[in-house]
Amino acid sequence: YDFTNCDFEKIKAAYLSTISKDLITYMSGTKSTEFNNTVSCSNRPHCLTEIQSLTFNPTAGCASLAKEMFAMKTKAALAIWCPGYSETQINATQAMKKARKSKVTTNKCLEQVSQLQGLWRRFNRPLLKQQGSSDYKDDDDKHHHHHH
């Protein structure tokens, strides 16, 4: 799915009002020094692509995130604010239901959610203005940036 045409401000509002709090609840009791973020994103559509992948695609050691409250709210936000997103997810949802019945919090899942928090931070405030893409739907001014 191409996230370019999503309403980023509405998704950001949904994240800040509820999803962020659900992520914090999920991570409660975890030391803030425990995980280093290894997944990054460069602009808002890219961030949503990575967020979708980490939230809904089962990975080795963490197959159950899609059933968490934050995942369901993420799915709802994308369905509402990304045109045509729902249609692309029907098969994925059915596969998800077959994949896992119970919710299990593993260390791998905690690490994955820590990565998600980092991706959402960059979605909320992209550090760099990427040439050829717009971080903000109404943004056409130039952001000064450097790559090291």
Epitope: E9, E34, S40, Q117, H148
Partner: antibody
Framework: EVQLVQSGAEVKKPGSSVKVSCKAS????????IEWVRQAPGQGLEWIGV????????NYNENFKGRATLTADKSTSTAYMELSSLRSEDTAVYYC????????????WGQGTTVTVSS | DIVMTQTPLSLSVTPGQPASISCKAS??????VTWYLQKPGQSPQLLIY???NHYTGVPDRFSGSGSGTDFTLKISRVEAEDVGVYYC?????????FGQGTKLEIK
């Protein structure tokens, strides 16, 4: 406990450079942006720039472009702000701050480093 | 650059009375506004993020509202510990910019 501890006060000559350090502890340094803000005596807050310690990406306020350089050392969890070609108007308290968990605010601030530029 | 203009620049309030600070942006900043308080001799501290969300430990007598270009910070009942300079900040566009600050004193 998250802490940002900055280097001590500096007195510099006009035209010279200053390098202020900001040592972070209590969290995964690479995961959060570090912002730099300054405050001239009796004045408000002015944003200098931001660095992503994870990959070194930076974004600068145009007012400081070419004079300010932000760097980060992951091995020591320390961020640095170097300001060159100092002038008297650069006399200020310089703060480092960490972005919050949502990426929409600065939740932890250093204690500030006073830089005095005087001949 | 987006200019954030605060009014009033200073206010003196009797303990227990309300206080209100306005912040106007020179162009729309959506909901990307944060409020900080800088107490005398201290570093700034976070109060409200994304217009109306309380930071951890901030008393609920503080509230934020607004969208687009007009924003307000309200203190329902001012207490002695609330003295200091209040700053609004936008993070919708680089460079990030702050208001000039509003100094709150106790009568």
């Amino acid at each position: 406990e998250v802490q940002l501890v900055q280097s001590g006060a500096e007195v510099k000559k006009p035209g010279s450079s200053v390098k202020v350090s900001c040592k972070a502890s209590g969290y995964a340094f690479s995961n959060y942006l570090i912002e730099w803000v300054r405050q001239a005596p009796g004045q408000g807050l002015e944003w200098i720039g931001v660095i992503d310690p994870g990959n070194g990406d930076t974004n600068y306020n145009e007012n400081f472009k070419g004079r300010a350089t932000l760097t980060a050392d992951k091995s020591t969890s320390t961020a640095y702000m170097e300001l060159s070609s100092l002038r008297s108007e650069d006399t200020a308290v310089y703060y480092c701050a960490r972005e919050d968990n949502t990426g929409t605010a600065f939740d932890y601030w250093g204690q500030g480093t006073t830089v005095t530029v005087s001949s | 650059d987006i200019v954030m203009t605060q009014t009033p620049l200073s206010l003196s309030v009797t303990p227990g009375q309300p206080a209100s600070i306005s912040c106007k942006a020179s162009q729309s900043v959506s909901s990307d506004v944060t409020w900080y308080l800088q107490k005398p001799g201290q570093s700034p501290q976070l109060l409200i993020y994304y217009v109306s969300n309380h930071y951890t430990g901030v008393p609920d007598r503080f509230s934020g509202s607004g969208s687009g270009t007009d924003f307000t910070l309200k203190i329902s009942r001012v207490e002695a510990e609330d003295v200091g300079v209040y700053y609004c900040q936008q993070h919708h566009r680089f460079p990030l910019t702050f208001g000039q600050g509003t100094k709150l004193e106790i009568k």
